[in-house]
């Protein structure tokens, strides 16, 4: 995969495939689903499915498509002005502090304490004190202080835009 | 987050070669475009090529175009610098930059992660 850099054969993006569509930058700027060539004179198209732009641009390089992992399903695919949406799968949710994965929700709160929020795919069960009502930090308890109680319905898709 | 540790950096006579690399560690290499810059003494930064994610689409400046050749190897989560003809001007501080794109100017878009560079000099 190497390509010497020459003046004849300027980059191998400007030998575009014949999905490819070209345009001329407006005020140097091309459009979503496109990347300026290495001249600044053209607008090439991204490749369906494979790479993205959602913004004008004057990128070199449109965006790999994000792949959803296992354990994700896809809810939107990827487009050339769009990247992948990709959600946990039911029973499983995306952690801010560690967005690379999904994590499975607890099956229950600990003893003392009482569900007040459904696992969805962003959040975990969400428990509360019985007495005072302050949310439970989100440790996992120990199994024995576990009172089980059946996964929450799964929430509706969260339309994201992007 | 990415890791880039360069290599293949050195002092070569005028008209000689070298191969930089750039081993990448950590996230996914392959979502990244790669992208090579320079910094010779008492000048600015000068972005000099770039690739894309899956190695179809490359980018180089006037300057170093018919000698130096940029590629990658997801596979081995790699980049490549080959300099061929190398001349005194090009004696610079080489940085491999991986990043999801570059702008036209040589700006990463988005989180950029860095090599921590390599010398190159290039005698007379």
């Known amino acids: 995969e190497s390509a010497l850099i020459t003046q004849q054969d300027l980059a191998p993006q400007q030998r575009a495939a014949p999905q490819q569509k070209r345009s001329s930058p407006s005020e140097g700027l091309c459009p979503p689903g496109h990347h300026i060539s290495e001249d600044g004179r053209d607008c090439i198209s991204c490749k369906y499915g494979q790479d993205y732009s959602t913004h004008w641009n004057d990128l070199l390089f449109c965006l790999r498509c994000t792949r959803c992992d296992s354990g994700e399903v896809e809810l939107s695919p990827c487009t050339t002005t769009r990247n992948t949406v990709c959600q946990c799968e039911e029973g499983t949710f995306r952690e801010e502090d560690s967005p690379e994965m999904c994590r499975k929700c607890r099956t229950g709160c600990p003893r003392g304490m009482v569900k007040v929020g459904d696992c969805t795919p962003w959040s975990d069960i969400e428990c509360v004190h019985k007495e005072s009502g302050t949310k439970h930090s989100g440790e996992v308890p120990a199994v024995e202080e576990t009172v089980t109680s059946s996964p929450g319905t799964p929430a509706s898709p969260c339309s994201l835009s992007g | 987050e990415v890791q880039l540790v360069q290599s293949g950096g050195g002092l070569v006579q005028a008209g000689g070669s070298l191969r930089l690399s750039c081993a990448a560690s950590g996230r996914a290499f392959s979502n990244y475009a790669l992208g090579w810059f320079r910094q010779a003494p008492g000048k600015e930064r000068e972005f000099i090529a770039a690739?894309?994610?899956?190695?179809?689409?490359?980018y180089g400046v006037d300057s170093v175009k018919g000698r130096f050749t940029i590629s990658r190897d997801n596979a081995q989560n790699m980049g490549y610098l080959q300099m061929n003809n190398l001349k005194p001007e090009d004696t610079a501080v080489y940085r491999c930059?991986?990043?999801?794109?570059?702008?036209?100017?040589?700006?990463?878009?988005?989180?950029?992660?860095w090599g921590q560079g390599t010398q190159v000099t290039v005698s007379s």
């Open positions: 690739i894309n994610w899956n190695g179809e689409n490359r």
């Open positions: 930059a991986a990043a999801l794109s570059f702008r036209l100017g040589g700006e990463p878009y988005g989180d950029a992660y």
